[in-house]
């Protein structure tokens, strides 16, 4: 018969022959022959392979280095890598999460639009008219100006994006 030019899923072509790939969690020891099956070997502790493969070496699990602000989110298995995330108050610098940086704070005049997570930084927004923030914070939103009217007071000093309005008593009409 003609030697194959393509193989089925979970197979690979070698020496004009279709051999079975090794399943996730195992690596290739030797290719199949006309008389023998592909020989695979389980990955050892701290190693993994996450696909059907013909790799001769398993990959080492990622190390979540506490010195870089990292911690383990999910422990690796023979078929999955370890997933790292950042300690509280920090977030990953990249999708691979190889190191962490401190969440940014929103300066006075800006409020938190979206609180940071282990994988994304704080998103700040300028306080619009009618709102203010007088602190640098990683979790405070812009606060609305105090409504003097509801307190039966009048605005004595206008608010800004960094300061609240100052309310005071209404001037009495002289008789």
């Amino acid at each position: 018969p003609e030697p194959p030019t393509a193989c089925r899923e979970k197979q690979y072509l070698i020496n004009s022959q279709c051999c079975s790939l090794c399943q996730p969690g195992q690596k290739l020891v030797s290719d199949c022959t006309e008389f023998t099956e592909t020989e695979c070997l389980p990955c050892g502790e701290s190693e993994f392979l996450d696909t059907w493969n013909r790799e001769t070496h398993c990959h080492q699990h990622k190390y979540c280095d506490p010195n870089l602000g990292l911690r383990v989110q999910q422990k690796g298995t023979s078929e999955t890598d370890t997933i790292c995330t950042c300690e509280e108050g920090w977030h990953c610098t990249s999708e691979a999460c190889e190191s962490c940086v401190l969440h940014r704070s929103c300066s006075p005049g800006f409020g938190v639009k979206q609180i940071a997570t282990g994988v994304s930084d704080t998103i700040c927004e300028p306080c619009p008219v009618g709102f203010f923030s007088n602190v640098s914070s990683a979790f405070e939103k812009c606060h609305p100006w105090t409504s003097c009217e509801t307190k039966d007071l009048v605005v004595q000093q206008a608010g800004t994006n960094k300061t609240d309005v100052v309310c005071g008593p209404q001037d009495r009409l002289r008789a």
Epitope: K27, V29, L41, P42, C43, G44, E45, S46, E47, C58, Q60, H61, Y63, C64, D65, P66, R71, V72, K75
Partner: antibody, heavy 118, light 106 residues
Framework: EVQLVQSGAEVKKPGATVKISCTVS????????IHWVKQRPGKGLEWMGR????????KYDPKFQGKVTMTADTSTDTAYMELSSLRSEDTAVYYC???????????WGQGTTVTVSS | QIVLTQSPTIMSASPGEKVIITCSAT?????ILWFQQKPGTSPKLWIY???NLASGVPARFSGSGSGASYSLTISRMEAEDAATYYC?????????FGGGTKLEIK
């Protein structure tokens, strides 16, 4: 800094039980396996078993099955190994150690000497 | 279970001499770890994943091998290398150690 600190030396009578502790710092104990290794005086290293502190899953060398019980307390980052029905051949230094790739060190405790003597 | 046999059991080498310690397994394993132990101290991880030097290990050490046959090599023996070396497999339970190779300085 990663450290594994073991409890102090023990002297026990034959038939007694001993429980050794291994407290880790510098990482969460639930994130890595803890292995226990035996070394009799002047002899080589023997792997006794390991525990996954996250779920308590254990694997023992059949030679130590029934002799050893491994447990862990994630709230105190401490692993324990209990040896029961002690005999003179249990006289040894016992070490706890981590999964090998923790920071490319395989961290080891300082060892706990257990002496079984009547 | 996998039995690891180390060879030689004991050896001595002169400073500057090349040293090779072998570790053979009764069947294929994914990788080998090597540990160094000096009297009265805890073992130290020396080589991981067959060929990677652990932190602080001098570059004169190397590891190689695959399947059931592995080795640790010291390119030029130094006095501080005198110790007992153990191989270990962590592929199949129960994990096992080799019997150890005691390396002395001449």
């Amino acid at each position: 800094e990663v450290q594994l600190v073991q409890s102090g030396a023990e002297v026990k009578k034959p038939g007694a039980t001993v429980k050794i502790s291994c407290t880790v710092s510098g990482f969460n104990i639930k994130d890595y396996y803890i292995h226990w290794v035996k070394q009799r005086p002047g002899k080589g290293l023997e792997w006794m078993g390991r525990i996954d502190p996250e779920d308590g899953d254990t694997k023992y060398d059949p030679k130590f099955q029934g002799k050893v019980t491994m447990t862990a307390d994630t709230s105190t980052d401490t692993a324990y190994m209990e040896l029961s029905s002690l005999r003179s051949e249990d006289t040894a230094v016992y070490y706890c150690t981590t999964s090998y790739y923790v920071g490319t060190y395989g961290y080891w405790g300082q060892g706990t000497t257990v002496t079984v003597s009547s | 279970q996998i039995v690891l046999t180390q060879s030689p059991t004991i050896m001595s080498a002169s400073p500057g001499e090349k040293v090779i310690i072998t570790c053979s397994a009764t069947s294929s394993v994914s990788y080998i770890l090597w540990f160094q132990q000096k009297p009265g101290t805890s073992p130290k991880l020396w080589i991981y994943s067959t060929s990677n030097l652990a932190s602080g290990v001098p570059a004169r050490f190397s590891g190689s091998g695959s399947g059931a046959s592995y080795s640790l090599t010291i390119s030029r023996m130094e006095a501080e290398d005198a110790a007992t070396y153990y191989c270990q497999q962590r592929t199949f339970y129960p994990y096992t150690f080799g019997g150890g190779t005691k390396l002395e300085i001449k």
